[in-house]
């Protein structure tokens, strides 16, 4: 139904990493424009991305107000140049998105190894606590702030001279591991939320190896 020259949006998809959240859809518009609305289950609809020819809408500002809420979005289609025109039912065509709960579903961004320091046969590896777009008291919260005890990191490490990997886990942003004296090691980390059923793990961080700038070696 609807006017002859508008089609409803389809394939509405949430793309979200570290709470940066964009709704995408199809098709590319031909003689039509879109407006997006977002709501919590119990809240009012709020309009965003008015009469756009884009097929995406950044909804980050809305979802970061409460990342534990469940959100629903819908995309309205209007004829280009005649946005007052409606479908046969008296309202514009629209399509609903899947429900989205940011806290449970946002992808974990690729972590970064901030530093590593060797003291004798111990190495301390520190993961950068990445800033999110979630705010409290006008301050942007870090990933650790937001996820707290739900977030762990897994460290993969191996001797530069071999391929056998070892793993360690931490519920902070730091690892303290034992290494063999005189050996160089390489490191990669991964963020994990074990309690999730989807998007449990980030991609691995870039590999950092001892003997490069990022680390510090102290013979004790």
């Amino acid at each position: 139904s609807g006017t002859t020259n508008t089609v409803a949006a389809y394939n509405l998809t949430w793309k979200s990493t570290n709470f940066k959240t964009i709704l995408e859809w199809e098709p590319k518009p031909v003689n039509q424009v879109y407006t997006v609305q977002i709501s919590t289950k119990s809240g009012d609809w709020k309009s965003k991305c008015f009469y756009t020819t884009d097929t995406e809408c950044d909804l980050t500002d809305e979802i970061v107000k409460d990342v534990k809420q469940t959100y629903l979005a819908r995309v309205f289609s209007y004829p280009a140049g005649n946005v007052e025109s409606t479908g046969s039912a008296g309202e514009p065509l629209y399509e609903n998105s899947p429900e989205f709960t940011p806290y449970l579903e946002t992808n974990l961004g690729q972590p970064t190894i901030q530093s590593f320091e060797q003291v004798g046969t111990k190495v301390n590896v520190t993961v950068e606590d990445e800033r999110t777009l979630v705010r409290r008291n006008n301050t942007f919260l870090s990933l650790r702030d937001v996820f707290g005890k739900d977030l762990i990191y897994t460290l993969y490490y191996w001797k530069s001279s071999s391929s056998g990997k070892k793993t360690a886990k931490t519920n902070t942003n730091e690892f303290l591991i034992d290494v063999d004296k005189g050996e160089n090691y390489c490191f990669s980390v991964q963020a994990v939320i074990p309690s999730r059923t989807v998007n449990r793990k980030s991609t691995d961080s870039p590999v950092e190896c001892m003997g490069q700038e990022k680390g510090e070696f102290r013979e004790i």
Epitope: K41, K68, Q69, R135, D145, V146, F147, G148, R196
Partner: antibody
């Protein structure tokens, strides 16, 4: 407003099981851990375990492993705690609790009214 | 399993200040232990004062504050009221489980 409504008092015989319910309302049920804490008469608080309703992920106190099971029913926003092989020392008030979320923070902010479970032959 | 230790009892004068401590048998308490402080008055359900080390609930009176001091979590009460007489429990998170302390009985006298 957040509310946690627990089921009524129970009297059980040693060796039996008890299933206590905690019905949540006023928030997004799936996103918050529900903690179970018990308090024996005249004693302190003891953590039993937790469940995240969205994924049914659970963590249990080692002391109760094998005896405690936590489940949830998302259609009714209710969490259940079942304790089996009851003994007299399980006589306690059983509480469910939920954290207050500020963008971060974890713990025991909102509490149910408690369910008294009495184990007696 | 870790043991969490609190002072069994403390006394404070009305209008006075007092610090309750929460120690961990495994070493220093850090922000990763997400210290919680819970108040319980006789015959009542527990109520939260502090979660996540230092976050007050909107219902928590401003005279209560949580922090880490040295190697332990502390709850400071500034300007005690008669109604603050209660048991106070701390709880610490250890990677995959919570542990409660034995509680501190605070008397306002």
């Amino acid at each position: 407003q957040v509310q946690l409504q627990e089921s009524g008092a129970e009297v059980k015989k040693p060796g039996a099981s008890v299933k206590v319910s905690c019905k949540a309302s006023g928030y997004t049920f799936s996103s918050y851990w529900i903690e179970w804490v018990r308090q024996a008469p005249g004693q302190g608080l003891e953590w039993m375990g937790e469940i995240l309703p969205g994924s049914a992920s659970t963590k249990y106190n080692e002391k109760f492993k094998g005896r405690v099971t936590m489940t949830r029913d998302t259609s009714t926003s209710t969490v259940y705690m079942e304790l089996s092989s009851l003994r007299s020392e399980d006589t306690a008030v059983y509480y469910c609790a939920r954290d207050y979320y500020y963008g971060s923070s974890y713990g025991f902010a909102y509490w149910g009214q408690g369910t008294l479970v009495t184990v007696s032959s | 399993q870790a043991v969490v230790t609190q002072e069994p009892s403390l006394t404070v004068s009305p209008g006075g200040s007092v610090t309750l401590t929460c120690r961990s048998s495994t070493g220093a308490v850090t922000t990763s232990n997400y210290a919680n402080w819970v108040q319980q008055k006789p015959g009542q359900t527990p109520t939260s004062l502090i979660s996540g080390t230092n976050n007050r609930g909107p219902w928590t009176p401003a005279r209560f504050s949580g922090s880490i001091l040295g190697d332990k979590a502390v709850l400071t009460l500034w300007g005690a009221h008669a109604e603050d007489e209660a048991d106070y429990f701390c709880a610490l998170w250890y990677s995959n489980h919570w542990v409660f302390g034995g509680g501190t009985k605070l008397t306002v006298l």
